[in-house]
């Protein structure tokens, strides 16, 4: 009778095991082991026992001991069960961003692992088991469907294999896949709201605001603002589930014309976009041209107003005749025209909007000097010892220099408060002088003596 020890073995893949073949007869003619495995007989003493080291056991095997005794041949099998953990445990790749409300299918693939009867595949969200199934097929595949919720955001999904050899006196061997981190999002169907000027003048700055409500997670939303090919750099302010992106836009003559302003919001693997047109225009202020900005009294002056070819102008409130980009008027310069403003207003229609521009020029009229009775009375009579202020105003442009002298030397203190004395009495020659010439006027000061009672 042939016997084998151990009769059952569980060992790691590639491992070794000692198998003893024994026979009940004292003098077996033959005693050995039948196996395709590499074997080493340990050459131990004794006729009725042989010990073999079987090595590099890669798969389940059933080595057979045999002996040939006088009473016949017999055999005995030992059952070698190889265990090994899976070589590959992985979740099928998925986009990391998933919209809330979508059904997400998690698929775990397991390659290898034995014995399969002891191998289980578990799908998990965090530490919560979603599904547990035995490993079947090669590769084994386990799937489950998850309805994506807001609170799944940032959750880790993974797949774990459990090779449970505790019933065989070994341990529980676990292998876990790389985690799949789910990013959930909500991007509303409504496009973002875009507020911007419809028209924008060359070499000026405008403000663009793009906003959207109902986003999750709002901090992950990307906002792209662009005017034509020009990417804008917005400052983004976040609310609980909304954002507002504000950007300054500067335009140059190269941008003139109709440009597309876009605001795109990207969240997860979806986007929403709003398009708007902005008309970039060039409209310099109208030009007011005076024949000469400074003329002498009585000179003929031409005032011209010129504006953008498509503009319509009014000069000092009078529309151009015919209505168009040019207007002019003629005048003879009078002292009253000195400091007179000539205002040209131009109006241009851009994308249905009326744009107004003004330009003003001032005319300077040179005249004088003048000394007249109203502003420089010819006769003053003042009581002696009274306080008086001699007044004499010379007119002209440029403003004349005024001096009043008695006997060519004694000055009358114009505009100053003085105590009237006898010395003040007399006739003064007031001389007003400017680049335009000079005029004189006699001013007499009479001093009344007090009556003595």
């Amino acid at each position: 009778q042939t016997s084998v020890s151990p009769s059952k073995v569980i060992l790691p893949r590639g491992g070794s095991v000692l198998v003893t073949c024994s026979t009940s007869c004292d003098q077996p003619k033959l005693l050995g082991i039948e196996t395709p495995l590499p074997k080493k007989e340990l050459l131990l003493p004794g006729n009725n026992r042989k010990v073999y080291e079987l090595s590099n056991v890669q798969e389940d095997s059933q080595p057979m001991c045999y002996s040939n005794c006088p009473d016949g041949q017999s055999t005995a099998k030992t059952f070698l069960t190889v265990y090994w953990t899976p070589e590959r445990v992985e979740l099928a790749p998925l986009p990391s961003w998933q919209p809330v409300g979508k059904n997400l299918t998690l698929r775990c693939q397991v390659e290898g692992g034995a014995p399969r009867a002891n191998l289980t595949v578990v799908l998990l969200r965090g530490e919560k088991e979603l599904k547990r199934e035995p490993a079947v097929g090669e590769p084994a595949e386990v799937t489950t469907t998850v309805l994506v919720r807001r609170d799944h955001h940032g959750a880790n999904f993974s797949c774990r294999t459990e090779l449970d050899l505790r019933p065989q006196g070994l341990e529980l061997f676990e292998n876990t896949s790389a985690p799949y981190q789910l990013q959930t999002f909500v991007l509303p169907a409504t496009p973002p709201q875009l507020v911007s000027p419809r028209v924008l003048e060359v070499d000026t700055q405008g403000t663009v605001v793009c906003s959207l409500d109902g986003l999750f997670p709002v901090s992950e939303a990307q906002v792209h603002l662009a005017l034509g090919d020009q990417r804008l750099n917005p400052t983004v302010t976040y609310g609980n589930d909304s954002f507002s992106a504000k950007a300054s836009v500067s335009v140059t003559a190269e941008d003139e014309g109709t440009q597309r302003l876009t605001c795109a919001v990207i969240l997860g693997n979806q986007s929403q976009e709003t398009l708007q047109t902005v008309t970039i225009y060039s409209f310099p202020a109208p030009n007011v041209i005076l024949t000469k900005p400074e003329v002498s009294e009585g000179t003929e002056v031409t005032v011209k107003c010129e504006a953008h070819p498509r503009a319509k102008v009014t000069l000092n409130g009078v529309p151009a005749q015919p209505l168009g980009p040019r207007a002019q008027l003629l005048l003879k310069a009078t002292p009253e025209d000195n400091g007179r403003s000539f205002s040209c207003s131009a109006t241009l229609e851009v994308a249905g909007q009326l744009i107004h521009k003004n330009q003003t020029r001032e005319l300077r009229v040179l005249y004088g000097p003048r000394l007249d009775e109203r502003d420089c009375p010819g006769n003053w009579t003042w009581p002696e010892n009274s306080q008086q202020t001699p007044m004499c105003q010379a007119w002209g442009n440029p403003l004349p220099e005024l001096k009043c002298l008695k006997d060519g030397t004694f000055p009358l203190p114009i505009g100053e408060s003085v105590t009237v004395t006898r010395d003040l009495e007399g006739t003064y020659l007031c001389r007003a002088r400017s680049t335009q010439g000079e005029v004189t006027r006699k001013v007499t000061v009479n001093v009344l003596s007090p009556r003595y009672e």
């Epitope: 003098q27 077996p28 003619k29 033959l30 005693l31 050995g32 082991i33 039948e34 196996t35 590499p38 074997k39 080493k40 007989e41 340990l42 050459l43 131990l44 003493p45 004794g46 006729n47 090595s55 045999y66």
Partner: antibody
């Protein structure tokens, strides 16, 4: 094919050391016992000892225990027979032989080397 | 220790049958292997496990084993069969030993 190739003939003086070799090819060298057999001039075969190259497990004949050392280097599939101090009586032909692999037993030497002649003379 | 006894020489005419014996205590309970060694050559296994012939060995070689004697029989002997023949067993009493017989010189007349 399975082959055992031994090193060439040696002529030595008494007291000298010697190592002869046996290189296996055509099979998994580590998985079979290699035995050494002496044949003195005009005499029969004498078993000296045996080694398992996989782990260098060794058994010696009582007649040769302490007289020779059997070793192996599995990285180069070679077994060795060595003496630390030769005597004239060590003059002989030495054979290495691979112990069998038959599934119905493994007791015979089924493959032999060509032999190495060792001459010890002063 | 276990001992194997062989006749030192056996002579036979070509074409005849040669019989070489190997004696040992209760040798029939052991497996016996036979080796042929031609002059100047290494031994070659010709019979193992009493009567099995390795591949490449002619059918003229056969073996048997019972009681206290194992026998190697060579039928229709040829000149090329002239060689020394050795029997071998393993002895596992109190250890592991390989035992060779003293050898038999077969002469083809």
């Amino acid at each position: 094919q399975v082959q055992l190739v031994q090193s060439g003939a040696e002529v030595k003086k008494p007291g000298e050391s010697l190592r002869i070799s046996c290189k296996g090819s055509g099979y998994s060298f580590t998985n079979y016992w290699i035995g050494w057999v002496r044949q003195m001039p005009g005499k029969g075969l004498e078993w000296m000892g045996i080694i398992y190259p996989g782990d260098s497990d060794t058994r010696y004949s009582p007649s040769f225990q302490g007289q020779v050392t059997i070793a192996a280097d599995k990285s180069i599939s070679t077994a060795y027979l060595q003496w630390s101090s030769l005597m004239a009586s060590d003059t002989a032909m030495y054979y290495c032989a691979r112990r069998g692999s038959r599934s119905s037993g493994e007791d015979a030497f089924e493959v032999w080397g060509q032999g190495t002649t060792v001459t010890v003379s002063s | 220790s276990y001992e194997l006894t062989q006749p030192p020489s056996v002579s036979v005419a070509p074409g005849k049958t040669a019989t070489i014996t190997c004696g040992g205590d209760n040798i029939g309970s052991k497996s016996v292997h036979w080796y042929q060694q031609r002059p100047g050559q290494a031994p070659v296994l010709v019979i193992n496990y009493d009567s099995d012939r390795p591949s490449g060995i002619p059918e003229r070689f056969s073996g048997s084993n019972s009681g206290n004697t194992a026998t190697l029989t060579i039928s229709r002997v040829e000149a090329g069969d002239e060689a020394d023949y050795y029997c071998q067993v393993e002895d596992r009493r109190g250890g592991y030993h390989v035992v060779f017989g003293g050898g038999t010189k077969l002469t083809v007349l």
